[in-house]
């Protein structure tokens, strides 16, 4: 067994069940007109 | 069948620690996605607080990071909530549902939690 | 952070009728690298959690009847139902599942004329 409190990731999603939305670094930040 | 509950207790007193547990049947926390903590205050929006995934890592809205930990217990296919600080503008419906990478496609009944002295 | 902006916030209509609702985000929820908008929608009723209805702006959820549609790109969405059910009658909200922290609209309240 295991209790944790984990640790801050920043990875994008890299499987199909991974629950990571994409997070691009690159994302735009213009808003919208 | 995939479920999720959350528990926990229904009136906090302000500056006080919330502590909430979802429960999770259905599939092991170790298989995968992540599950995230969301919360909605009466009659408004939702709100995502932050999730853990199903690797231990975990990721925190910066509007509340200062007060939070998202933690598992595996051998319970339990996470737990901490929220420190606890303040009347807290006060809110706090559901956990399971995030695939498109959406939340499970999510618990909440819990509602009133912070008041 | 990605705003969403629901319009409007509420709607009457009576069953039978041909519903729309609109989100827009602050900021493209395009992602290059699979040409999907990560926008999804969900319902809510009076005391019960949200309900996945669509993810990836137009596909589907299991089990949602083919009445609800989503459609957009970018950052202008739509959700329509095509012929308002009874049980259609809840709140609506739009969710951008692109960037974290992840960001819920404001909702639309759809009630019976």
């Known amino acids: 067994s295991e209790t944790t409190t984990g640790t801050s990731s920043n990875s994008s999603q890299s499987t199909s069940n991974s629950g990571l939305a994409p997070n691009p670094t690159n994302a735009t930040t213009k808003a919208a007109g | 069948q995939v479920t999720l509950k959350e528990s926990g207790p229904a009136l906090v007193k302000p500056t006080q620690t919330l502590t909430l547990t979802c429960t999770v049947t259905g599939y092991s926390i170790t298989s995968g996605y992540t599950v995230s903590w969301i919360r909605q205050p009466p009659g408004k929006a939702l709100e995502w607080i932050g999730y853990i995934q199903y690797t231990g890592s975990t990721r925190y809205n910066p509007s509340l990071k200062t007060r939070l930990t998202i933690s598992r217990d595996t051998s319970k296919n339990q996470f737990v909530l901490t929220m420190t600080n606890m303040d009347p503008v807290d006060t809110a419906t706090y559901y956990c549902a399971r995030g695939t990478t498109a959406s939340f496609d499970y999510w618990g009944q909440g819990t509602t939690v009133t912070v008041s002295s | 952070d990605i705003q969403m902006t629901q319009s409007p916030s509420s709607l009457s209509a009576s069953v039978g009728d041909r519903v729309t609702i609109t989100c827009r985000s602050s900021?493209?929820?395009?992602?290059?690298?699979?040409?999907?908008?990560?926008l999804t929608w969900y319902q809510q009723k009076p005391g019960k959690a949200p309900k996945l209805l669509i993810s990836w702006a137009s596909t589907l959820a299991s089990g949602v009847p083919s009445r609800f549609s989503g459609s957009g790109s970018g950052t202008d969405f739509t959700l329509t139902i095509s012929s308002l059910q009874p049980e259609d009658f809840a709140t609506y909200y739009c969710?951008?599942?692109?960037?974290?922290?992840?960001?819920f609209g404001g909702g639309t309240k759809l009630e019976i004329k």
């Open positions: 969710q951008q599942y692109f960037i974290y922290p992840l960001t």
């Open positions: 900021q493209s929820l395009l992602y290059s690298s699979d040409q999907k908008n990560y």
